[in-house]
């Protein structure tokens, strides 16, 4: 007769690992025990279980409650046990020793191996401004048995470094996301992906980039100066610009205050009807936690009779 | 014919000693894992201690532990227990038995035991 | 350690009767269990053990049987010789321990 076992046993922690040993016999061949120890080496046998042909199942008690025999119908060749829960601590060599008749002893080895699935965080680097150099954007780190792997999935450009820490029984992988912060990145996700055999999937964790920024500032409105005439209704003019945090806006006259009237309404200044009051220098003051911005306009209202006097003059001149 | 024979007991004031005996027949001793099991007058049995064929196995009941010590010779087929610090309530009939051999190497259990002797009594008395 | 109850602690009977006692584990001892026959001044005798297997030369009348915590010896038609202290014994654990014994008197 003959042993069939396996030479590795995987499970993940907390799953239920079946320690297989089967003996193969002539006919007429009989089982008497088999006995299961830990043989870790550097270290004296640790009994597990006994399963006897008479007596039934012991459990040493080192394993009370988490050995049991694989559910019926059963084999009386078949000295498999059923580990339950298995944890990091039981990974290593285990023995089963088939006691035969007529036979005699056999005995096989295999050995427990315990995958430890990582538990993945993500952590956002120091706050993204354009115009930085290169920056942390995130970091990845996961632990696991054994060592995972930590990757990027990105459309944004950037560089990677990875490091690892040998544990015990277990090994943390960290990977970091480098990168030049532009606008561009805005909005744009960055995703750790942790891939290990104790998963059924990669586990994946994104990060959306925030870059801070403001935009130039300008105005529109006066793109028509003629529309800027006495007695013109719906006036207004419009401030420009963009920012992350996305920014306020602030009006006021550089030569004065806002003539009565006026309304400001975030980004816009309305025009009651245009009288030549309203002619001025108007700044529109843009601002976010990461920079401010101005942009000045001159208006200038037109009186259309001063404006055909002058025409009239002006041909009359000619 | 299995025999089992203690020998040794007999009248020990408290905190004496006295070494018991049992010589073993009719099997082959060296494969055997021995225990001493004892019954005090009127009362139930009490296992006391069991010793591996090698010797590199032994235990002993938390009442006797650090007191008594079990011993064997294989080449004179001798089982002994050494019973040092006697107190009254190790007054006993001491018999010794074989363990049924239908374990093989596997110290966390113990197996039936299928020959005893005819009992040795000890009396610890002042 | 295991504690072992054996019930009744005395019972009395006839020849010819059908006498029961059980024994209960305080704890699951799978079948690791042996029962023993005690005459007054003698040494207990071994009648059977794995709970259920007879030892040799030991009168099938006596049988034993149950498997975890609770375990029965029959004997099946009580003989005068058969008057004696049982006793339940667990070997799953070191200690192996002892119920507090049956005796079978003639009623």
């Known amino acids: 007769g003959e042993l069939e076992t396996s030479d590795v046993v995987t499970v993940v922690l907390g799953q239920d690992a079946k320690l297989p040993c089967f003996y193969r016999g002539d006919s007429g061949e009989q089982v008497g025990q088999v006995a299961w120890a830990r043989v870790d080496a550097g270290e004296g046998a640790q009994e597990l279980a006994l399963l006897h042909s008479k007596y039934g199942l012991h459990v040493s008690p080192a394993y009370e409650g988490r050995v049991e025999q694989p559910p019926p119908p059963r084999n009386p060749l078949d000295g498999s046990v059923l580990l339950r829960n298995a944890v990091q601590a039981d990974e290593g060599e285990y023995e089963c020793r088939v006691s035969t008749f007529p036979a005699g002893s056999f005995q096989a080895r295999l050995r427990l191996r315990v995958l430890v699935p990582p538990l993945p965080s993500l952590n956002p680097g120091p706050a993204l401004e354009e115009g930085q150099g290169l920056t942390l954007a995130a970091s990845c780190t996961a632990e696991g048995s054994p060592a995972p792997s930590v990757t990027w999935d990105t459309e944004v450009k950037g560089t990677t470094s990875s490091r690892s820490f040998k544990h015990s029984r277990s090994a943390a992988v960290t990977s970091e996301f480098h990168l030049v912060p532009s606008r561009s990145m805005n909005g744009q996700p960055l995703t750790c992906v942790v891939s290990h055999p104790g998963l059924l999937q990669d586990q994946r964790i994104t990060h959306i980039l925030h870059v801070s920024f403001l935009a130039e500032a300008s105005v529109r409105g006066l793109e028509d100066q003629n529309l800027w005439h006495i007695g013109r209704e719906g006036a207004m003019l419009k401030c420009l610009s963009e920012g992350q945090p996305p920014p306020s806006y602030n009006w006021t006259r550089l030569d004065g205050p806002l003539p009565s009237g006026v309304r400001v309404d975030g980004d816009t200044l309305g025009f009651p009807p245009l009288t030549t009051e309203h002619s001025g220098i108007y700044v529109c003051h843009v601002s976010n936690e990461f920079s401010s911005r101005d942009s000045q306009v001159t208006v200038d209202v037109l009186d259309p009779q001063e404006d055909s006097g002058k025409q009239v003059d002006l041909v009359s001149a000619s | 014919e299995v025999q089992l024979v203690e020998s040794g007991g007999g009248l020990v004031q408290p905190g004496g000693s006295l070494r018991l005996s049992c010589a073993a027949s009719?099997?082959?001793?060296?494969?055997?894992?021995m225990s001493w099991v004892r019954q005090a007058p009127g009362k139930g049995l009490e296992w006391v201690s069991v010793?591996?064929?090698?010797?590199?196995?032994?235990n002993y009941a938390d009442s006797v532990k650090g007191r008594f010590t079990i011993s064997r010779d294989n080449s004179k087929n001798t089982l002994y227990l050494q019973m040092n610090s006697l107190r009254a309530e190790d007054t006993a009939v001491y018999y010794c038995?074989?363990?049924?051999?239908?374990?093989?190497?596997?110290?966390?259990?113990?197996?039936?035991?299928?020959?005893w002797g005819q009992g040795t009594l000890v009396t610890v008395s002042s | 350690d295991i504690q072992m109850t054996q019930s009744p602690s005395s019972l009395s009977a006839s020849v010819g009767d059908r006498v029961t006692i059980t024994c209960r584990a305080s704890?699951?001892?799978?079948?690791?269990l042996a029962w023993y026959q005690q005459k007054p001044g003698k040494a207990p005798k071994l009648l059977i053990y794995?709970?259920?297997s007879l030892q040799s030369g030991v009168p099938s009348r006596f049988s034993g049987s149950g498997s975890g915590t609770d375990f029965t010896l029959t004997i099946s038609s009580l003989q005068p010789e058969d008057f004696a202290t049982y006793y339940c014994?667990?070997?799953?654990?070191?200690?192996?321990?002892f119920g507090q014994g049956t005796k079978v008197e003639i009623k």
């Open positions: 038995a074989r363990e049924y051999s239908d374990v093989v190497d596997y110290v966390s259990v113990r197996t039936p035991l299928d020959y």
């Open positions: 009719g099997f082959n001793f060296s494969d055997f894992d």
């Open positions: 014994q667990q070997h799953y654990t070191t200690p192996p321990t």
């Open positions: 010793i591996k064929p090698s010797g590199d196995y032994i």
């Open positions: 704890q699951g001892i799978s079948s690791y």
């Open positions: 794995a709970a259920s």
